[in-house]
């Protein structure tokens, strides 16, 4: 039975040109995390495998940095980076857990004068 839960940073905002950390946390289970996939809509950004380490998709390697921890750092943000991001935890023996983060990338002036979402 899958008893675990995924906690995420939820809805977050960041300035165009800046960077943001995406974090998810798996709790309430004793399952072993074998791999975490980070995806944007249907695109794979990165994989963190417990045995093999990090793999960053070639198309994102200049703007995605691994970590901290199992998280992912997005750099040089553009307005096109606005959207849904998913952390997919592959665990044994539970199976797969998925967390969702919505990122809104704002023009600098907009972010300075009251973003719709607050960074936790």
């Amino acid at each position: 039975m899958m008893t675990g839960t995924i906690e995420t940073t939820g809805n977050i905002s960041a300035e165009k040109g800046g960077s943001i950390i995406l974090q998810c946390h798996l709790s309430s289970t004793t399952a072993q995390v074998t791999q975490v996939n980070w995806e944007q809509q249907d695109q794979l950004l990165a994989i963190c495998n417990a045995d093999l380490g990090w793999h960053i998709s070639p198309s994102f390697k200049d703007r995605v940095a691994p970590g901290p921890g199992l998280g992912l750092t997005l750099q040089s943000l553009t307005v096109n980076d606005t959207g849904e991001y998913f952390c997919i935890y592959h665990t044994y023996p539970d199976g797969t857990y998925t967390g969702r983060i919505f990122l809104e990338v704002l023009e600098s002036s907009v972010a300075e004068h009251g973003a719709r979402f607050q960074i936790p």
């Epitope: 709790s27 093999l52 990090w54």
Partner: antibody, heavy 116, light 107 residues
């Protein structure tokens, strides 16, 4: 098996610099972070910084910004840490470790002694 | 920086007893806490990762729990070889930080 090899000891004079190595084997060097940790005699563990061999990205504990420099030689799967302007406060054991946020493999540590 | 406070500083117990160490973070770190054991003159050894995940080769008497700001390392039925220093470490944000450590002495 996965191993991190470090030289046992370095004796250096005050004001000088030292560059210590950490040679990795048994895994793909470019996919795991290499971390450096300081431990003064009888004291706790202090994280210095990390470096990601796949891209050369570094992060530092601000306390070590002007003290430590982390570099790589990916061709030999070796990470390096240089410590500059050494004082007695830098006398310590320095560990390298492999990590994904957690540090699952540790070297035996390099004991740095700063003495004239 | 995230501050990790460990307690107790020193614990002295007899073999067979159950012991617990506390690690409190200055802000929420989710489940991004690791526990390490360091015996005298040895390198640290990873015991628990991400709050509760067990590590291959580590005896099952070691377990971790907690999330947010409060974490616990428990040793069920302590053995003499468990005499060591124990450290927690957070990987929620750079710079990563360690707690000050807890010493376990076996009577």
């Amino acid at each position: 098996q996965v191993q991190l090899q470090q030289p046992g000891a370095e004796l250096v004079k005050p004001g000088a610099s030292v560059k210590m190595s950490c040679k990795a084997s048994g895994y793909t060097f470019t996919t795991f972070w290499i971390n450096w940790v300081k431990q003064r005699p009888g004291q706790g563990l202090e994280w210095i910084g990390d470096i990601f061999p796949g891209r050369g990205i570094t992060n530092y504990n601000g306390k070590f910004n002007n003290k430590a420099t982390l570099t790589l030689d990916t061709s030999s799967s070796t990470a390096y840490m240089q410590l500059s302007s050494l004082t007695s406060e830098d006398s310590a054991v320095y560990y390298c470790s492999r990590g994904l946020g957690y540090f699952d493999v540790w070297g035996a540590g390099t004991t740095v002694t700063v003495s004239s | 920086d995230i501050l990790l406070t460990q307690s107790p500083a020193i614990l002295s117990v007899s073999p067979g007893e159950r012991v617990s160490f506390s690690c409190r973070a200055s802000q929420s770190v989710g489940t991004s806490i690791q526990w390490y054991q360091q015996r005298t003159n040895g390198s640290p050894r990873l015991l628990i990762k991400y709050g509760f995940e067990s590590i291959s080769g580590i005896p099952s008497r070691f377990s971790g729990s907690g999330s947010g700001t409060d974490f616990t390392l428990s040793i069920n039925s302590v053995e003499s070889e468990d005499s060591a220093d124990y450290y927690c470490q957070q990987s929620y944000r750079w710079p990563y930080t360690f707690g000050g450590g807890s010493k376990l002495e076996i009577k």
